[in-house]
């Protein structure tokens, strides 16, 4: 399977909410011994590899924000911790998964990475990630709503093994 990032850049004004999205593509094994661990974290382009460093999102780690379920099942983070930090991650039946961030500030700017790990028989078998940039703009020149910029077809299917 692969992870696609429909948008590579989100430009938002302070105070707005945004939903960053990744999509699971390709054949997904739905056997009951196969589950998917999906999560989000901040990172940098890095001098070596994008998404190699895992930084917290609003002080929540990738472990705090993870979803863990079978194939294309739906799931979302219902725990209070994420919601207290204005965050919610979710996954639907179609392989889309997302993180919603509320009341953005400049401090939320940066590179965001989604990570999917396929787990078979309790062992990590395959992991892929996608990356996208969030730019939060301040002041009079900021857009009134979030503007999203599609990934190039090459970027959109991010097959980088982590």
């Amino acid at each position: 399977f692969k992870v696609a990032t429909p948008y590579s850049l989100y430009v938002c004004p302070e105070g707005q909410n945004v939903t960053l999205t990744c999509r699971l593509l390709g054949p997904v094994d739905k056997g009951h011994d196969v589950t998917f661990y999906k999560t989000w974290y901040r990172s940098s382009r890095g001098e070596v590899q994008t998404c190699s460093e895992r930084r917290p999102i609003r002080n929540l780690t990738f472990q705090d924000l993870h979803l863990h379920h079978g194939g294309h099942q739906a799931a979302n983070t219902s725990h209070d911790l994420a919601q207290r930090h204005g965050l919610e991650s979710a996954s639907d039946h179609h392989g889309n998964f997302s993180i919603t961030m509320r009341n953005l500030t400049l401090l939320d700017s940066g590179l965001y990475c989604c990570l999917v790990v396929e787990i078979r028989h309790h062992h990590s078998e395959h992991r892929v990630h996608g990356a996208m940039e969030l730019q939060v703009q301040t002041g009079k020149d900021a857009p009134s709503n979030c503007v999203v910029y599609p990934s190039s077809s090459q970027d959109s299917e991010n097959i980088t093994a982590a």
Epitope: R42, S43, S44, R45, G46, E47, R55, P56, R58, N59, H85, T105, L106, L107, S109, G110, L111, E133, Q135, Q137, T138, G139
Partner: antibody, heavy 121, light 111 residues
Amino acid sequence: QVQLQESGPGLVKPSETLSLTCAVSGYSITSDYAWNWIRQPPGKGLEWIGFITYSGSTNYNPSLKSRVTISVDTSKNQFSLKLSSVTAADTAVYYCARSHYGSTYWYFDVWGQGTTVTVSS
Amino acid sequence: DIVMTQTPLSLSVTPGQPASISCRASESVEYYGTSLMQWYLQKPGQSPQLLIYAASNVESGVPDRFSGSGSGTDFTLKISRVEAEDVGVYYCQQTRKVPWTFGQGTRLEIK
């Protein structure tokens, strides 16, 4: 080890444009961090001017925004400050500095040695 | 703008004695549990150098006699035993909201 080095004319005439460059060695400015300009008028405190991030987005101090442009030259691994319509009040030591970006912590961890700019006819 | 107010503005300390500088922000500098408050020292004729970030984290290479504390709007920098090399101007700074702002500075001298 990351090093920052400011350069530019030490004397600028009133109403002209001040142009400074910060050369970065030991790190690629397109990999991470925000790259800042800060100034310090003679005998006074520090004033943040603005930054450009590794991805090219900028943020400026609203008090200077109409006159400031920060840009990057990736081929030379350097970033620049342009401040238009200068007056004597823009006389200061100008520092470039690196700040964390895209993480929980934002702070200036590496500074250049500073360059003195005097605005005078 | 967030206004940073430092006290005292000058300080004269005997070597080996402790020193303390306060900084008050005009509004909270908290961001989801982190205080976005820094302390810098500018030694005579030099660029500022980072001492403390996020209110209480001591930057690598900074002597452990420096410590920072506080949250919300009130912060303190402490030097447990002042040494001659600690002379200079100390600045607090917030990165919670643009424009990022500094305190007016506290000058430390040795008695």
